[in-house]
């Protein structure tokens, strides 16, 4: 009689992550007796997958009944693969022997493949925030792939970016992947609504790419621009001074009137206009009482924008002169204004 | 449900022999080994040995090796484990437990008293 | 034979606390085939970790193994009252079985 064989059809198996795997193995003799055990890898540590007689098992079901007499049907199927699974599966006959059972004959081995998809793309951007014209980076990292191939692009606005690197880990054989990738962006004024995407496209994910955002709103500091105006009020006595606060972001604002360097009031923006672009205006005003001043009034507006070094802007006051014919007037903008006489 | 319902306590004297019962059901009786583990009181764990209830064959702890008999009747799906030229030391709870190490009996506890 | 020597044999500790149980074999076992158990008074043990470090169906997962060679390690981050018991590691590598000792876990 011929010598047993033991014969795995399938030389490679791919599976997606979560499904099972059949692995066929069937011998060719009912002779020796002696069970069949399934392992993964070889050598002295490989690891028991499957022993039909002994052992826990909760992931392992037999193909076919293996305590009918004359079954030469040894395969099985392994539930909920992971990546973890992948590597090259043996089913192994073995003769009864004493005091342990003596390893017969191998099959020549199936390897199993895992496709696993890449997780989310999670996007991060610096810690601090910065100013336009800066260049900051953004990280992109996604976990848990297989195979290794993927592809990583950058996009601001729906436009590609140019300036990333991507690497993946680990460089050699792995059961599962992770990519990592930084990219470098040149901040703008109107970046205020714009968005960094990363996208990720893996053989798993059937031509729909995953994709991270990243808002620039979290990333950039719009400084504000000042202007202080001198209006003409009804009174012969009063003048109205006014700062305009513009285009900056994010919101958070606090503004201090000085009357020749002492502080005069302060406040914390809160009724603020917003710009096609994002960005904010906010306009401040003091009515002064001319008659209250002998001479000349130097007015600063100084504004400390989102716990930056506070900017200003100037305004002298000549009480000498004819309150109407000073400044011009841009009343327009004046909506949740503020009010404040000095005597 | 897997279950393995064992035989009651006995009361032996030294030098007899004590045959326990382990009735399964809930599974393939063919399927997996029958093992026999012992526990002296305030002990730990000793393996006797099993039996694969599809052919017959059994191993041993030579430890018991000579003294220890397990066999199985397939058709009402029970194992069996006698144990000959009992001493005081013997005195125990026997556990059948199903191959995959999950399924454990309830114990039978075998008194050696003269 | 393979020998199983665990350790502590005693390891009193209180509700919250991390207890790190010991095996170790006189000779090398395949992770695949050491198991864990715990048993509390008048019952038979129960199958806590199988293949070394994988968690048995229903078993908390506060409770951990690990190890290769010859040295494992049961952990249980924080114990829980009902986890005071005694734990055996087993090995059914090879003829004939054994299990360990075991250790008690007491409250302190």
């Known amino acids: 009689e011929e010598e047993l064989q033991v014969i795995q059809p399938d030389k490679s198996v791919l599976v997606a992550a979560g499904e099972t795997a059949t692995l066929r193995c069937t011998a060719t003799s009912l002779i020796p007796v002696g069970p069949i055990q399934w392992f993964r890898g070889a050598g002295p540590g490989r690891e028991l997958i499957y022993n039909q007689k002994e052992g826990h098992f909760p992931r392992v079901t037999t193909v076919s009944d293996l305590t009918k007499r004359n079954n030469m049907d040894f395969s099985i199927r392994i539930g909920n693969i992971t990546p973890a699974d992948a590597g090259t599966y043996y089913c192994v006959k073995f003769r009864k022997g004493s005091p342990d059972d003596v390893e017969f004959k191998s099959g020549a081995g199936t390897e199993l493949s895992v496709r696993a998809k890449p997780s989310a793309p999670v996007v991060s951007g610096p810690a601090a925030r910065a100013t336009p014209q800066h260049t900051v980076s953004f990280t992109c990292e996604s976990h848990g792939f297989s195979p290794r191939d993927i592809t990583l692009k950058w996009f601001k606005n729906g436009n590609e970016l140019s300036d990333f690197q991507t690497n993946v880990d680990p460089v050699g054989e792995s059961v599962s992947y992770s990519i990592h990738s930084t990219a470098k962006v040149v901040l703008t004024r109107e970046d205020v609504h714009s968005q960094v995407i990363c996208e990720v496209a893996h053989v798993t994910l059937q031509g729909d790419p995953l994709r991270g955002t990243a808002n620039l709103s979290e990333t950039i500091r719009v400084p504000p621009t000042l202007e202080v105006t001198q209006q003409p009020v009804r009174a012969e006595n009063q003048v109205n001074v006014t700062c305009q606060v513009r285009k900056f972001y994010p919101q958070r604002l606090q503004l201090t009137w000085l009357e020749n360097g002492n502080v005069s009031r302060t406040e914390t923006a809160s009724t603020v206009t917003e710009n096609k672009d994002g960005t904010y205006n906010w306009m401040s005003w003091l009515l002064v009482n001319v008659s209250a001043h002998r001479d000349d009034v130097k007015l600063t507006c100084q504004v400390e924008h989102d716990g930056q070094p506070a900017v200003s802007k100037s305004h002298d006051l000549k009480v000498s002169a004819h309150p109407k014919e000073q400044g011009s007037n841009t009343a327009a903008e004046n909506t949740g204004s503020n009010e404040r006489n000095i005597y | 449900e897997v279950q393995l319902v064992q035989s009651g306590a006995e009361v032996k004297k030294p030098g007899a022999t004590v045959k326990i019962s382990c009735k399964a059901s809930g599974f393939n009786f063919e399927d997996t080994y029958i093992h026999w583990v012992q526990q002296a009181p305030g002990k730990g764990l000793e393996w006797m040995g099993r039996i694969d209830p599809a052919d017959g064959d059994t191993k041993h702890n030579p430890k018991f090796h000579d003294r220890v008999t397990i066999t199985v009747d397939t058709s009402t799906n029970t194992a069996y484990m006698e144990l000959s030229s009992l001493r005081s030391e013997d005195t125990a709870v026997y556990y059948c437990v199903r191959g995959n190490y999950v399924n454990w009996g309830q114990g039978t506890t075998v008194t050696v008293s003269s | 034979e393979i020998v199983l020597t665990q350790s502590p044999a005693t390891l009193s500790l209180s509700p919250g606390e991390r207890a790190t149980l010991s095996c170790r074999a006189s000779?090398?076992?395949?992770?695949?085939?050491l198991y864990w158990y715990q048993q509390k008074p008048g019952q038979a043990p129960r199958l806590l970790i199988y293949?070394?470090?994988n968690l048995a169906s229903g078993i908390p997962a506060r409770f951990s193994g690990s190890g290769s060679g010859t040295d494992f390690t049961l952990t249980i981050s924080s114990l829980e009252p009902e986890d005071f018991a005694v734990y055996y590691c087993?090995?059914?590598?090879?003829?004939?079985?054994?299990f360990g000792g075991g250790t008690k876990v007491e409250i302190k």
């Open positions: 000779s090398s076992v395949t992770s695949s085939y």
């Open positions: 293949s070394a470090s």
């Open positions: 087993h090995q059914w590598y090879s003829y004939p079985r054994t």
